[in-house]
Interface confidence: low
């Protein structure tokens, strides 16, 4: 049967009545429905609402809807002792503690099961010392203390803002620092835009807020104690001490009110210069210890946490294809909140639920796709992405096989400014041909595409006319699928105006005010934005289920890959000397970089002119875009992150949220200036440079003619 | 001198309600987190409930929780617990104590008895 035959109707009609049917009201629905109460990943609410999303898909008419349950190392606070820090006199008695829980919002006083503020992963611990103000917690800031300002964080409990990097990556640079303790707070100069009001009659953090959230180190390994294999009835686990990717200092985080009383009081040195002051209202020294009259006092942590082996639930929905149902498209977002979840991660869910009511709909209608669209709500995402990743080994011989793409969907808005998109480059002309097709939400936009007011108001910074696309990095349930498995995978949300809010992240993220009626209320009133990312997300899930010819455009690979290869280049290029010493070259990487263009571009001729009727052609090169990002995988993985595979793409080292691209290399240049055995790192430089070139010349050639 | 000293205990019947204070001098209240603490005749010590320096934060031992209410007044330096529902099981000597577990300082107790 050809593509139009097994889906009824022609594609342009499906396409239109897919999005037709996709209703803002019905998304605000979901979202209500799914914020009523706490789905922390491990208990009963949350497997009580996967049983729902289970029975209202299959109702949607998915044709099977299954439950993939795990047993996972989780982490939980002890509820009959209390997690708290304290300042303690000479005498050793308290004279300050922390909030013990976040005040509850309006109208939630009375729900129970709130999980108190923790950070997820901590192991238990009462350390006492010594306040060392760390900024940001980032490579930079501990470079900035240690080398500049003589600062020793050995023994010391460090205090570090949220902000700029994931917190895993703060609690590791405090631990390689020497630190005992972690201190996590929110500074309202990152969680408290001007001119806005707090919670409840704004969408900012008030003082008692607080973001919970993991603190660990997985580097893509899934659940700590089962790395590279699903955590199942029969699983071999791990011992807790060779557990990946813990923790080894205590780990707590505060709010705003809390954090000014302890760093009201600190001593030692000045910041050294404005980046490291926030917005309260106190000096921002950076220590060791108090000021004159409180240097005798301390601080001490009380962290009792448990880390437990629990179940966790996904729900796979499966919409079979009808011409190739050997080949997926994923559609996946987490289920799992800290507290209520509105926006992290039900905006996300409940647009994933309408999506598959939509597709649902037009299969009661006869209509299938041409490939097998699979669905998933993830489990316990919030401590570390466990969920997918498991799910992800477990099929991971069908996944490498028969992926084609995988869409991301989890908070469908951090603001309603305007869109962004993280993707694959083979991603780049899908994502800008559907954006032409959809109204764009935005005031002062009526009547024109969403590619207009995109591109408007995040241009790209280095092509004209075009909006910003970046890179994928981590701290999502694409991970595996990108990182590990080598599937073309991408994200699209409603982001925040970033040159006017230079706040982190949104403010009440990972806090108990984080409800539907923030919202409701503050972001999407009329659940327009909600609609726009169903559209994008649902829009590209049905462009790559259902197109005749996969949309990926290999040309736009061949593009990027220049541009790594010449910032990666110039980076090496701040040591002349020592390249000219060690005979560092790049000229592999970049006739490799070459060849991938010439060959990106005779395939993409050959892709207009091959006869399409012909099932056995089309399939040939469906499979050549297909596995091209598969082709970028390295099966030993980077160095000391061996499920970190892709050799263009991987989350930086510093940052598990950003991208960085060639990592490989760029991680071997990395403060290579102050490493003990230069002729060694400069070994491993070159090494490097030959696994990136290498990798690029294998992928071109896996677009070459076949035989 | 540090000192806690408990009130309001004294013989109810079940389903009754009983508010016990807990007046703090020596130190300066309103810094400290402050807990009950209760201890029936014969068993160990059980935790019942604790509340944060600024009153915002609030937490309750699963067996009291929907009937006991804990609170301060910073202004008088002065604990409470607002006992309701009371159950023969809730009899106990009820201490305050200052700061978090583990607690430096405690009252002498105040004797609560729950009988029909």
């Known amino acids: 049967k050809s593509s139009n035959e097994a889906t009824n109707i022609t594609p342009k009609h499906n396409m239109k009545a897919f999005l037709d049917e996709l209703k803002a009201e019905n998304i605000k629905k979901f979202l209500y429905n799914f914020t009523q109460i706490p789905h922390l990943a491990g208990t009963e609410q949350n497997f009580q609402l996967a049983k729902q999303i289970q029975s209202q898909w299959k109702e949607f008419g998915l044709d099977s809807v299954e439950l993939a349950h795990y047993d996972v190392l989780l982490s939980y606070p002890n509820k009959t002792h209390p997690n708290y820090i304290s300042i303690i006199n000479e005498d050793g008695n308290e004279i300050f503690n922390t909030s013990l829980f976040e005040p509850p919002p309006p109208g939630y006083e009375n729900v129970s099961d709130i999980v108190p503020p923790f950070s997820a992963f901590s192991p238990q611990g009462m350390p006492e010392g010594d306040l060392v103000y760390v900024n940001y917690a980032r490579t930079e800031d501990f470079f900035k203390l240690e080398r500049d300002m003589k600062i020793n964080c050995s023994g010391k409990i460090v205090i570090a803002r949220y902000g700029k990097v994931f917190r895993g990556n703060k609690v590791k640079n405090a631990q390689l620092a020497g630190a005992k303790g972690v201190i996590l707070y929110s500074d309202p100069a990152d969680y408290f835009a001007p001119g806005v009001k707090s919670y409840p009659d704004g969408w900012n953090l008030p003082g008692g807020g607080v973001q919970r959230g993991n603190i660990l180190n997985l580097n893509g390994a899934g659940d700590p104690l089962t790395p590279g294999y699903p955590a199942n009835e029969y699983a071999y686990r791990r011992g807790i001490a060779e557990a990946v990717g813990l923790p080894s200092i205590p780990v707590h985080p505060i709010g705003y009110y809390d954090a000014q009383k302890l760093l009201e009081k600190m001593g030692g040195s000045a910041p050294p210069d404005s980046s490291w002051r926030g917005s309260l209202k106190v000096p921002y020294n950076v220590g060791p210890g108090f000021t004159g009259n409180f240097s005798t006092q301390k601080v001490k942590m009380h962290i009792h946490s448990t880390n437990e082996v629990t179940r966790i639930y996904n729900v796979i929905g499966t919409l079979r294809g009808a011409v190739e149902p050997d080949r997926y498209v994923i559609l996946g977002g987490h289920r799992d909140s800290w507290v209520f979840g509105g926006i992290d991660p039900q905006s996300g869910a409940a647009v994933v639920h309408e999506i598959v009511r939509s597709f649902g709909t037009l299969k009661k209608e006869g209509w299938r796709p041409r490939r097998t669209i699979l669905f998933a709500s993830w489990d316990a995402e919030e401590f570390g992405l466990l969920g997918s990743t498991e799910w992800a080994e477990e099929n991971s011989r069908l996944l490498q096989e028969r992926g084609v793409a995988y869409i991301n969907a989890d908070s469908s808005i951090e603001g309603n400014y305007t869109l962004r998109v993280d993707c694959t480059p083979l991603m780049y002309s899908l994502v800008h041909n559907l954006t032409k097709e959809l109204k764009s939400p935005d005031e002062g936009f009526e009547g024109k595409s969403l590619y207009e007011s995109w591109t408007k108001k995040s241009p790209s910074p280095e092509f004209s006319g075009m909006p910003r696309i970046s890179k994928l990095g981590s701290g999502n349930d694409f991970e595996v699928f990108f990182q590990r498995l080598g599937i073309a995978s991408g994200r699209a949300r409603y982001t925040k105006n970033w040159e006017t809010n230079k706040f982190s992240g949104y403010p009440l993220y990972h806090s108990v005010y984080e409800t539907y009626e923030l919202v409701e209320k503050f972001y999407d009133p009329m659940f327009k934005y909600h609609l726009t990312v169903a559209q994008v997300r649902g829009g590209m899930v049905f462009e790559l289920a259902n197109s005749i010819v996969l949309p990926f455009d290999c040309r736009d690979y061949a593009v990027v890959l220049r541009k790594y290869a010449d910032k990666i280049y110039s980076i090496s290029m701040k040591h002349p000397q020592e390249m000219k010493t060690y005979s560092v070259s790049f000229d592999s990487l970049f006739s490799a970089v070459k060849n991938f263009t010439e060959i990106a571009s005779k395939f993409s001729e050959r892709l207009q002119d091959f006869d399409k009727s012909n099932p056995i052609v089309l399939r040939m090169m469906n499979d050549q875009l297909m596995f091209l990002e598969r082709a970028f995988i390295d099966p030993l993985g980077l160095p000391d992150r061996p499920f970190y595979r892709h050799v263009i793409y991987a989350p930086s080292s510093h940052n598990k949220y950003a991208g960085e691209s060639f990592p490989g290399i760029y991680d071997a240049l990395f403060d290579i200036e102050s490493k003990v055995d230069p002729s060694k790192a400069w070994g491993e430089v070159k090494r490097q440079i030959y696994v990136a070139a290498f990798t690029v010349q294998a992928a071109a050639e896996t677009l070459s003619e076949v035989a | 001198e540090v000192q806690l000293v408990e009130s309001g205990g004294g013989v109810v019947q079940p389903g009754r309600s009983l508010r016990l204070s807990c007046a703090a001098s020596?130190?300066?209240?309103?810094?400290?987190?402050m807990h009950w603490v209760r201890q029936a005749p014969g068993k160990g010590l059980e935790w019942v409930a604790i509340i944060s320096y600024d009153g915002n934060s609030k937490y309750y031992t699963d067996s009291v929780k929907g009937r006991f209410t804990i609170s301060r007044d910073n202004s008088k330096n002065t604990l409470y617990l607002q006992m309701n529902s009371l159950r023969v099981e809730d009899t106990a000597v009820y201490y305050c104590?200052?700061?978090?577990?583990?607690?430096?300082?405690w009252g002498q107790g105040t004797t609560v008895t729950v009988s029909s």
């Open positions: 104590a200052k700061g978090l577990w583990p607690s430096d300082v």
């Open positions: 020596g130190f300066t209240f309103n810094n400290y987190g």
